[in-house]
Interface confidence: low
Protein backbone atom coordinates (compact mmCIF):
# COMPACT_ATOMS: atom_id res chain seq x y z
CA UNK A 1 0.00 0.00 0.00
CA UNK A 2 1.19 3.43 -0.85
CA UNK A 3 2.35 4.91 2.77
CA UNK A 4 2.24 8.43 1.16
CA UNK A 5 -1.46 8.45 1.07
CA UNK A 6 -3.02 7.35 4.06
CA UNK A 7 -6.23 9.74 5.52
CA UNK A 8 -7.16 8.76 8.94
CA UNK A 9 -11.32 8.77 9.45
CA UNK A 10 -13.17 11.39 10.81
CA UNK A 11 -15.27 10.39 13.32
CA UNK A 12 -18.93 11.74 14.97
CA UNK A 13 -21.40 10.41 16.62
CA UNK A 14 -25.11 11.71 15.54
CA UNK A 15 -27.48 11.66 18.63
CA UNK A 16 -30.83 9.89 18.90
CA UNK A 17 -34.01 11.25 16.88
CA UNK A 18 -36.29 12.24 20.08
CA UNK A 19 -39.16 11.12 17.08
CA UNK A 20 -38.31 7.26 17.28
CA UNK A 21 -37.61 7.65 21.35
CA UNK A 22 -41.49 8.56 21.63
CA UNK A 23 -42.17 6.24 18.94
CA UNK A 24 -40.34 3.07 19.79
CA UNK A 25 -39.37 3.77 23.25
CA UNK A 26 -36.11 2.95 21.94
CA UNK A 27 -32.52 5.20 20.74
CA UNK A 28 -30.41 4.64 18.37
CA UNK A 29 -27.13 6.69 18.08
CA UNK A 30 -25.13 6.43 14.84
CA UNK A 31 -21.19 6.79 14.49
CA UNK A 32 -19.54 7.47 11.14
CA UNK A 33 -16.77 7.22 9.90
CA UNK A 34 -15.71 9.02 6.97
CA UNK A 35 -13.02 9.66 4.25
CA UNK A 36 -10.30 6.88 5.51
CA UNK A 37 -7.61 5.57 3.09
CA UNK A 38 -7.00 2.63 2.93
CA UNK A 39 -9.83 0.45 4.47
CA UNK A 40 -8.96 -0.88 7.53
CA UNK A 41 -10.62 0.21 10.91
CA UNK A 42 -12.19 -1.59 13.37
CA UNK A 43 -15.14 0.33 15.06
CA UNK A 44 -16.38 -0.32 18.82
CA UNK A 45 -18.89 1.21 21.07
CA UNK A 46 -18.47 2.03 24.67
CA UNK A 47 -20.69 2.90 26.95
CA UNK A 48 -19.98 3.87 30.67
CA UNK A 49 -15.94 3.11 29.55
CA UNK A 50 -16.82 -1.01 29.00
CA UNK A 51 -17.11 -2.49 25.33
CA UNK A 52 -20.44 -3.30 24.04
CA UNK A 53 -21.75 -5.44 21.62
CA UNK A 54 -25.13 -5.82 22.22
CA UNK A 55 -27.30 -3.57 20.53
CA UNK A 56 -24.53 -3.03 18.22
CA UNK A 57 -24.48 -3.23 14.54
CA UNK A 58 -21.61 -2.31 11.94
CA UNK A 59 -21.55 -2.12 8.23
CA UNK A 60 -19.72 -5.47 7.29
CA UNK A 61 -17.19 -3.80 4.83
CA UNK A 62 -16.51 0.13 4.63
CA UNK A 63 -18.30 1.55 1.40
CA UNK A 64 -16.47 3.29 -1.16
CA UNK A 65 -17.28 7.10 -1.18
CA UNK A 66 -16.60 7.33 -4.51
CA UNK A 67 -17.46 4.19 -6.13
CA UNK A 68 -16.25 5.28 -9.45
CA UNK A 69 -12.72 5.99 -8.42
CA UNK A 70 -10.09 2.83 -7.59
CA UNK A 71 -8.84 4.24 -5.13
CA UNK A 72 -11.58 6.13 -3.49
CA UNK A 73 -11.75 7.31 0.35
CA UNK A 74 -14.09 4.78 2.25
CA UNK A 75 -16.58 5.38 4.96
CA UNK A 76 -17.95 2.99 7.92
CA UNK A 77 -21.09 3.31 9.99
CA UNK A 78 -22.43 1.80 13.23
CA UNK A 79 -25.36 2.03 14.99
CA UNK A 80 -25.69 1.37 18.88
CA UNK A 81 -29.57 1.06 20.34
CA UNK A 82 -30.27 1.17 23.67
CA UNK A 83 -33.47 1.51 25.68
CA UNK A 84 -35.23 4.91 25.82
CA UNK A 85 -34.87 5.34 29.77
CA UNK A 86 -31.03 4.40 28.70
CA UNK A 87 -30.17 7.22 26.77
CA UNK A 88 -32.30 9.54 28.95
CA UNK A 89 -30.13 9.05 31.74
CA UNK A 90 -27.25 11.51 31.70
CA UNK A 91 -25.14 9.91 33.60
CA UNK A 92 -24.57 7.31 30.94
CA UNK A 93 -21.86 7.83 28.50
CA UNK A 94 -21.52 6.38 25.24
CA UNK A 95 -18.16 6.81 22.88
CA UNK A 96 -17.97 5.40 19.41
CA UNK A 97 -13.98 4.52 18.97
CA UNK A 98 -12.60 3.83 15.28
CA UNK A 99 -9.29 2.34 15.20
CA UNK A 100 -7.11 2.98 12.46
CA UNK A 101 -4.24 1.30 10.76
CA UNK A 102 -1.49 3.59 8.61
CA UNK A 103 1.05 5.85 8.54
CA UNK A 104 1.21 9.87 8.03
CA UNK A 105 3.27 11.11 5.24
CA UNK A 106 4.97 13.37 8.00
CA UNK A 107 5.05 10.51 10.46
CA UNK A 108 8.44 10.37 12.86
CA UNK A 109 7.84 6.96 13.71
CA UNK A 110 11.24 5.17 14.01
CA UNK A 111 10.79 1.39 13.87
CA UNK A 112 10.58 -0.54 11.01
CA UNK A 113 8.07 1.35 8.65
CA UNK A 114 6.28 -2.07 8.03
CA UNK A 115 4.73 -1.86 11.43
CA UNK A 116 1.37 0.12 11.58
CA UNK A 117 0.59 2.68 14.24
CA UNK A 118 -2.53 2.47 15.59
CA UNK A 119 -4.73 5.56 16.05
CA UNK A 120 -7.23 5.79 18.30
CA UNK A 121 -10.27 8.48 16.66
CA UNK A 122 -13.00 8.36 19.12
CA UNK A 123 -16.39 10.70 19.18
CA UNK A 124 -18.83 10.49 22.50
CA UNK A 125 -22.39 11.38 24.11
CA UNK A 126 -24.07 11.77 26.56
CA UNK A 127 -27.06 10.42 27.91
CA UNK A 128 -29.41 13.36 27.81
CA UNK A 129 -31.59 14.51 30.54
CA UNK A 130 -33.98 17.22 29.04
CA UNK A 131 -31.33 19.43 28.47
CA UNK B 1 -33.86 -12.90 10.57
CA UNK B 2 -37.52 -12.44 11.19
CA UNK B 3 -38.30 -9.61 12.13
CA UNK B 4 -42.08 -9.59 15.02
CA UNK B 5 -43.67 -6.51 14.45
CA UNK B 6 -42.25 -4.37 11.69
CA UNK B 7 -42.45 -0.94 12.02
CA UNK B 8 -40.19 1.11 9.24
CA UNK B 9 -39.53 4.37 10.15
CA UNK B 10 -37.04 6.97 8.74
CA UNK B 11 -35.65 9.11 11.76
CA UNK B 12 -33.23 12.58 11.15
CA UNK B 13 -30.42 12.51 13.29
CA UNK B 14 -28.48 15.07 14.67
CA UNK B 15 -24.97 16.23 14.51
CA UNK B 16 -22.88 18.68 16.38
CA UNK B 17 -23.52 22.49 14.83
CA UNK B 18 -19.64 21.84 13.57
CA UNK B 19 -20.41 19.36 11.59
CA UNK B 20 -22.26 20.06 8.24
CA UNK B 21 -23.31 16.40 7.31
CA UNK B 22 -26.93 15.34 7.31
CA UNK B 23 -28.04 11.33 8.71
CA UNK B 24 -31.05 9.33 8.17
CA UNK B 25 -32.24 6.50 9.79
CA UNK B 26 -34.16 3.89 8.00
CA UNK B 27 -35.14 1.41 10.67
CA UNK B 28 -37.57 -1.12 12.00
CA UNK B 29 -38.73 -2.39 8.63
CA UNK B 30 -39.23 -6.40 7.22
CA UNK B 31 -36.84 -8.15 6.43
CA UNK B 32 -38.10 -8.57 2.83
CA UNK B 33 -37.61 -4.90 1.98
CA UNK B 34 -34.40 -4.63 0.15
CA UNK B 35 -32.62 -0.97 0.95
CA UNK B 36 -31.33 0.37 -2.70
CA UNK B 37 -27.75 2.29 -3.26
CA UNK B 38 -28.27 6.46 -4.54
CA UNK B 39 -28.05 7.07 -7.56
CA UNK B 40 -26.61 10.56 -6.26
CA UNK B 41 -22.56 10.25 -5.76
CA UNK B 42 -22.76 12.62 -3.00
CA UNK B 43 -25.79 10.52 -1.08
CA UNK B 44 -23.88 7.95 0.81
CA UNK B 45 -26.32 4.82 1.91
CA UNK B 46 -25.06 1.58 3.58
CA UNK B 47 -26.78 -2.07 3.13
CA UNK B 48 -29.13 -3.48 5.42
CA UNK B 49 -27.80 -4.86 9.04
CA UNK B 50 -29.16 -6.37 11.39
CA UNK B 51 -28.99 -4.90 15.48
CA UNK B 52 -30.12 -7.56 17.85
CA UNK B 53 -30.73 -6.03 21.63
CA UNK B 54 -30.18 -9.45 23.67
CA UNK B 55 -31.41 -8.11 27.05
CA UNK B 56 -34.74 -6.79 25.25
CA UNK B 57 -35.01 -10.02 22.67
CA UNK B 58 -35.54 -7.62 20.15
CA UNK B 59 -34.03 -7.66 16.52
CA UNK B 60 -34.25 -5.20 13.98
CA UNK B 61 -33.23 -3.61 10.53
CA UNK B 62 -31.68 -0.82 9.72
CA UNK B 63 -30.23 1.53 7.02
CA UNK B 64 -28.29 4.68 7.20
CA UNK B 65 -28.01 7.59 4.77
CA UNK B 66 -25.66 10.66 4.78
CA UNK B 67 -24.52 13.32 2.62
CA UNK B 68 -23.27 16.84 3.09
CA UNK B 69 -25.16 18.23 0.84
CA UNK B 70 -27.21 21.44 2.28
CA UNK B 71 -30.22 20.59 0.82
CA UNK B 72 -30.22 16.68 1.50
CA UNK B 73 -33.43 15.61 3.33
CA UNK B 74 -34.52 11.82 4.95
CA UNK B 75 -38.08 12.35 2.73
CA UNK B 76 -35.80 11.84 -0.23
CA UNK B 77 -32.67 9.59 1.05
CA UNK B 78 -34.23 6.57 0.25
CA UNK B 79 -35.96 7.35 -2.60
CA UNK B 80 -35.19 4.77 -5.09
CA UNK B 81 -36.12 2.27 -2.20
CA UNK B 82 -39.97 1.31 -1.62
CA UNK B 83 -40.47 3.56 1.57
CA UNK B 84 -44.51 4.32 2.63
CA UNK B 85 -44.90 7.71 2.86
CA UNK B 86 -45.97 7.37 6.43
CA UNK B 87 -42.79 6.59 7.52
CA UNK B 88 -40.92 9.67 7.90
CA UNK B 89 -40.53 11.48 11.35
CA UNK B 90 -39.80 14.99 11.25
CA UNK B 91 -36.99 15.84 13.59
CA UNK B 92 -38.37 18.47 15.99
CA UNK B 93 -35.78 21.60 16.42
CA UNK B 94 -34.20 21.44 19.63
CA UNK B 95 -34.65 23.88 22.33
CA UNK B 96 -31.41 22.87 24.14
CA UNK C 1 -19.62 29.45 24.44
CA UNK C 2 -17.11 27.98 26.30
CA UNK C 3 -13.84 29.59 26.85
CA UNK C 4 -10.38 28.23 28.28
CA UNK C 5 -7.67 29.76 30.03
CA UNK C 6 -4.62 27.76 30.27
CA UNK C 7 -2.10 29.00 33.07
CA UNK C 8 0.91 27.51 35.36
CA UNK C 9 3.65 26.72 31.99
CA UNK C 10 7.14 28.01 32.65
CA UNK C 11 10.67 26.54 32.77
CA UNK C 12 11.70 23.57 34.77
CA UNK C 13 14.92 21.46 35.28
CA UNK C 14 14.83 18.00 34.01
CA UNK C 15 13.37 15.72 36.96
CA UNK C 16 11.08 18.79 38.32
CA UNK C 17 7.37 19.35 38.44
CA UNK C 18 4.77 21.81 37.17
CA UNK C 19 0.76 21.85 37.86
CA UNK C 20 -1.20 22.86 35.31
CA UNK C 21 -4.46 24.85 35.12
CA UNK C 22 -7.61 25.47 32.66
CA UNK C 23 -10.25 27.48 33.50
CA UNK C 24 -13.45 27.24 31.55
CA UNK C 25 -16.32 29.93 31.45
CA UNK C 26 -19.33 30.17 29.64
CA UNK C 27 -21.92 27.37 29.27
CA UNK C 28 -19.77 24.83 31.47
CA UNK C 29 -23.35 22.97 32.53
CA UNK C 30 -22.52 21.28 28.77
CA UNK C 31 -18.83 19.92 29.22
CA UNK C 32 -18.85 16.57 29.41
CA UNK C 33 -14.95 15.80 28.52
CA UNK C 34 -12.04 17.74 29.47
CA UNK C 35 -8.33 17.29 27.79
CA UNK C 36 -4.39 18.00 27.90
CA UNK C 37 -3.01 17.97 24.38
CA UNK C 38 0.65 19.41 23.94
CA UNK C 39 2.51 20.35 20.38
CA UNK C 40 6.27 20.66 20.46
CA UNK C 41 8.22 22.77 17.94
CA UNK C 42 7.71 21.14 14.46
CA UNK C 43 5.29 18.26 15.48
CA UNK C 44 1.81 17.54 15.47
CA UNK C 45 -0.69 18.27 18.26
CA UNK C 46 -1.38 15.26 20.70
CA UNK C 47 -3.20 13.93 23.40
CA UNK C 48 -1.93 13.93 26.62
CA UNK C 49 -4.76 13.28 28.94
CA UNK C 50 -8.58 13.52 28.97
CA UNK C 51 -10.99 13.18 32.08
CA UNK C 52 -14.91 13.07 31.63
CA UNK C 53 -17.77 14.60 34.08
CA UNK C 54 -17.73 11.08 35.49
CA UNK C 55 -13.86 11.22 36.15
CA UNK C 56 -13.13 9.03 33.83
CA UNK C 57 -9.30 9.54 33.12
CA UNK C 58 -7.06 8.14 29.83
CA UNK C 59 -3.74 9.53 29.30
CA UNK C 60 -1.00 8.88 26.72
CA UNK C 61 1.31 6.47 27.24
CA UNK C 62 4.49 9.04 27.46
CA UNK C 63 2.04 10.01 29.92
CA UNK C 64 1.60 7.23 32.31
CA UNK C 65 2.68 6.96 35.80
CA UNK C 66 4.43 10.74 35.45
CA UNK C 67 1.20 12.98 35.04
CA UNK C 68 -1.87 13.16 36.85
CA UNK C 69 -5.26 14.83 35.30
CA UNK C 70 -7.69 15.90 37.93
CA UNK C 71 -10.94 18.76 38.00
CA UNK C 72 -12.41 21.02 40.52
CA UNK C 73 -15.77 21.06 39.30
CA UNK C 74 -16.64 23.62 41.62
CA UNK C 75 -13.79 25.83 40.54
CA UNK C 76 -14.50 24.88 36.51
CA UNK C 77 -10.80 23.82 36.39
CA UNK C 78 -8.92 21.36 35.22
CA UNK C 79 -5.62 20.60 36.18
CA UNK C 80 -2.28 18.37 34.83
CA UNK C 81 -0.07 17.72 37.78
CA UNK C 82 3.38 16.72 35.75
CA UNK C 83 6.06 14.89 37.50
CA UNK C 84 9.25 13.49 36.42
CA UNK C 85 9.62 16.34 33.42
CA UNK C 86 12.22 15.39 30.39
CA UNK C 87 13.42 17.64 27.70
CA UNK C 88 11.14 15.94 25.53
CA UNK C 89 7.88 17.01 27.41
CA UNK C 90 9.10 20.67 26.19
CA UNK C 91 5.72 21.61 24.41
CA UNK C 92 2.42 23.86 24.00
CA UNK C 93 0.14 22.54 26.32
CA UNK C 94 -3.49 23.16 25.49
CA UNK C 95 -6.75 22.47 27.11
CA UNK C 96 -9.40 21.02 25.36
CA UNK C 97 -13.19 20.67 26.20
CA UNK C 98 -16.03 19.01 24.59
CA UNK C 99 -19.66 19.79 25.47
CA UNK C 100 -22.57 17.14 24.75
CA UNK C 101 -21.90 15.34 21.69
CA UNK C 102 -18.72 15.88 19.41
CA UNK C 103 -17.16 17.64 18.18
CA UNK C 104 -18.75 20.88 20.22
CA UNK C 105 -15.24 21.56 20.58
CA UNK C 106 -13.27 24.33 22.46
CA UNK C 107 -9.67 24.78 22.89
CA UNK C 108 -8.00 27.47 25.20
CA UNK C 109 -4.33 29.34 23.52
CA UNK C 110 -2.30 27.26 25.10
CA UNK C 111 0.57 27.01 28.15
CA UNK C 112 4.83 26.77 27.03
CA UNK C 113 5.62 24.31 28.98
CA UNK C 114 9.98 23.82 29.06
CA UNK C 115 12.07 21.50 29.96
CA UNK C 116 15.91 22.38 30.33
CA UNK C 117 18.98 22.33 32.39
Known amino acids: EDLKKVFPPKVAVFEPSEAEISHTQKATLVCLATGFYPDHVELSWWVNGKEVHSGVSTDPQPLKEQPALEDSRYSLSSRLRVSATFWHNPRNHFRCQVQFYGLSEDDEWTEDRDKPITQKISAEAWGRADC | PYIQNPDPAVYQLRGSKSNDTSVCLFTDFDSVMNVSQSKDSDVHITDKTVLDMRSMDFKSNGAVAWSNKSDFACTSAFKDSVIPADTFFPSPESSC | EVQLVESGGGVVQPGGSLRLSCVASGSVHKINFYGWYRQAPGKEREKVAHISIGDQTDYADSAKGRFTISRDESKNTVYLQMNSLRPEDTALYYC???????????WGQGTLVTVSS
Open chain 3, 96 to 106: RALSRIWPYDY
